[in-house]
Interface confidence: low
């Protein structure tokens, strides 16, 4: 499958529009601070070069790898050292070290201004004036803020973004039509980015084997009627796709993802009965649909797992002959029978099974040793079940905002060294598990909740990795991918933490809070709550609730006052004094 010119091959496979969009995403994900116009210039240069290679694959430089071509282009940016500091040193390296160097400098939390949404009329005018530039800007702004966003999926988001503007800018009430669609895209986009970030972390921090295990479990749940060999083939192909995207090889990734979707649809009879509708859609929608497709029904009369994996006299023989294949079969068989389990739970069970076989297959009587292995699974299954039950009860009792606050307090006490914005962001997202998953019946709660929590805790891990401040976070994040959530759940109050000095400035509020959206106002209050806990980590729930209730009343009162600023200044001082007294600060 060797091509004389890789760049010509990808240009022909993907078409000019997708080629340009993917190169823009790639460059924006690497050079996150560069202005839009600079990126467009680089993309146009690469595209013109690609066209010369399509015309003549033997032309000068057309035989170079995509990493070499793109890296060379990125290294022409004159302001590289001024803007990116030591990232400029990457340019002195040869491939593949240069690309690895660029990857290491991707920033999960770039210092970029918040995206402010202009007025609807302004957006519609910009869309009509220059549709192409408008959509490119969308790709650029998302890609630079989410340097691991799944590139072919971002093309799908851009297509929906374009459709929303095409439809709504002609509507009688543009805002009523457009704003809910943009909100939905924003929320789905954040979720998609976080899910992909976990896949990349899994590959980069824990290796291909960890990712493949995750994929075996998830695809076996989704396609329980497919044979193990079929699932294995899909896992291999999916691993290649995600390895490419996480490695910045976006053209190859998008091309291979399209090939995988094509293969799945051509072989849907041996994969799943749920794929029919997906496979009738155009490419981007098709790939998205397959990725989100519901689990197929489990085959009837599946035999007991014990026969092959506990009772058989060949267990150790089969394990010794091909360890990963045998463990893969175990995971496949267990997962296809348990759509009610989270993927991480299935991986914990497989790890327990592997550990038991490692120990027992070297023992005098292996069968006697591993005969009770399935009994070891019981506590592993019950732990997330109980946790989800308790937290869903708490969520139903408190509602989302107060449930988030309970988690804010819980996590601030566990890891008070973590920055306040990170604690607020992560705890708010953890709290969303309630409205996302607690509405589901028992059989769907665990896969929804625990796999979502894995995604959110990965956000904490990648943000913390940038500026590590807590050994406990580092430990939970690096020891085991599948045990991250149990590790964080098991953390108690950090007794070694020295409370933060009280700073009245942190609790000084102004009239601008009155004009904020409900969400932004919540974030302000939750920021204050985290700071309170950092000052007084031993404060009781009741004490914190009293202070927060007073705070809510204070904001409400001053926002209704004629002279808001004076009210905030005077009443604020009283509130701080009262809070200090209540908490013994």
């Amino acid at each position: 499958d060797a091509h004389k010119s890789e760049v010509a091959h990808r240009f022909k496979d993907l078409g000019e529009e997708n080629f340009k969009a993917l190169v823009l995403i790639a460059f924006a994900q690497y050079l996150q601070q560069c202005p839009f116009e600079d990126h467009v210039k680089l993309v146009n240069e690469v595209t013109e070069f690609a066209k010369t290679c399509v015309a003549d694959e033997s032309a000068e430089n057309c035989d170079k790898s995509l990493h070499t071509l793109f890296g060379d282009k990125l290294c022409t940016v004159a302001t590289l050292r001024e803007t990116y500091g030591e990232m400029a040193d990457c340019c002195a390296k040869q491939e593949p070290e240069r690309n690895e160097c660029f990857l290491q400098h991707k920033d999960d939390n770039p210092n970029l201004p918040r995206l402010v949404r202009p007025e609807v009329d302004v957006m519609c005018t910009a869309f009509h004036d220059n549709e192409e530039t408008f959509l490119k800007k969308y790709l650029y702004e998302i890609a630079r803020r989410h340097p691991y966003f799944y590139a072919p999926e971002l093309l799908f988001f851009a297509k929906r973004y374009k459709a929303a503007f095409t439809e709504c800018c002609q509507a009688a009430d543009k805002a009523a039509c457009l704003l809910p669609k943009l909100d939905e895209l924003r929320d789905e986009g954040k979720a998609s980015s976080a899910k992909q970030r976990l896949k990349c972390a899994s590959l980069q921090k824990f290796g291909e084997r960890a990712f493949k295990a995750w994929a075996v479990a998830r695809l076996s749940q989704r396609f329980p009627k497919a044979e193990f060999a079929e699932v294995s083939k899909l896992v291999t192909d999916l691993t290649k796709v995600h390895t490419e995207c996480c490695h910045g090889d976006l053209l190859e990734c998008a091309d291979d993802r399209a090939d995988l979707a094509k293969y799945i649809c051509e072989n849907q009879d041996s994969i799943s009965s749920k794929l029919k509708e997906c496979c009738e859609k155009p490419l981007l929608e098709k790939s998205h649909c397959i990725a989100e497709v519901e689990n197929d029904e489990m085959p009837a009369d599946l035999p007991s797992l014990a026969a092959d994996f506990v009772e058989s006299k060949d267990v150790c023989k089969n394990y010794a002959e091909a360890k990963d294949v045998f463990l893969g079969m175990f995971l496949y068989e267990y997962a296809r029978r348990h759509p009610d389990y989270s993927v991480v739970l299935l991986l914990r069970l497989a790890k327990t099974y592997e550990t038991t076989l490692e120990k027992c297959c070297a023992a005098a009587d292996p069968h006697e040793c591993y005969a009770k292995v399935f009994d070891e699974f019981k506590p592993l299954v019950e732990e997330p079940q109980n946790l989800i039950k308790q937290n869903c009860e708490l969520f139903e009792q408190l509602g989302e905002y107060k449930f988030q606050n309970a988690l804010l307090v819980r996590y601030t006490k566990k890891v008070p060294q973590v920055s306040t914005p990170t604690l607020v962001e992560v705890s708010r997202n953890l709290g969303k598990v309630g409205s996302k998953c607690c509405k589901h019946p028992e059989a769907k709660r665990m896969p929804c909740a625990e796999d979502y929590l894995s995604v959110v805790l990965n956000q904490l891990c990648v943000l913390h990795e940038k500026t590590p401040v807590s050994d406990r976070v580092t430990k939970c994040c690096t020891e085991s991918l599948v045990n991250r959530r149990p590790c964080f759940s098991a953390l108690e109050v950090d007794e070694t933490y020295v409370p933060k000095e009280f700073n009245a400035e942190t609790f000084t509020f102004h009239a601008d809070i009155c004009t904020l959206s409900e969400k932004e106002r919540q974030i302000k209050k939750q920021t204050a709550l985290v700071e309170l806990v950092k000052h007084k980590p031993k404060a009781t729930k009741e004490q914190l609730k009293a202070v927060m209730d007073d705070f809510a009343a204070f904001v409400e009162k001053c926002c209704k006052a004629d002279d808001k600023e004076t009210c905030f200044a005077e009443e604020g001082k009283k509130l701080v004094a009262a809070s200090q007294a209540a908490l013994g600060l």
Partner: nanobody, 115 residues
């Protein structure tokens, strides 16, 4: 094999001028941005100036702005640094690098500004 060979250094009086050259080989010179970097005795390397692959875009460290000019000739695979109004603090070994790296990959050329 990537090779960068600098020349044009020497001893010059304060206020004088020098033109440094850097001959490149072993890579597609016209595809890369290039930089000049200097290292004074007993100090770490200091980035001086950079130019993009086409020569259209240039950038300078504050300490040399208005006095130094970076240029390139892609046909000759050569990078230049025109240094005017030289000061004693410009004394250093000057070397060219690919991109804007400050990791030294060549011998460099000595520039000494002294009366």
């Amino acid at each position: 094999q990537v090779q960068l060979v600098e020349s044009g250094g020497g001893l010059v009086q304060p206020g004088g001028s020098l033109r440094l050259s850097c001959a490149a080989s072993g890579f597609t010179f016209g595809s890369f941005g290039m930089s000049w970097v200097r290292q004074a005795p007993g100090k770490g390397p200091e980035w001086v100036s950079a130019i993009d692959s086409s020569g259209a875009d240039t950038i300078y460290a504050e300490s040399v702005k208005g006095r130094f000019t970076i240029a390139r000739d892609n046909a000759k695979k050569t990078l230049y640094l025109q240094m005017n109004s030289l000061k004693p603090e410009d004394t250093a070994v000057y070397y060219c690098t690919i991109g804007q790296s400050i990791s030294r990959g060549s011998q460099g050329t000595q520039v000494t500004v002294s009366s």
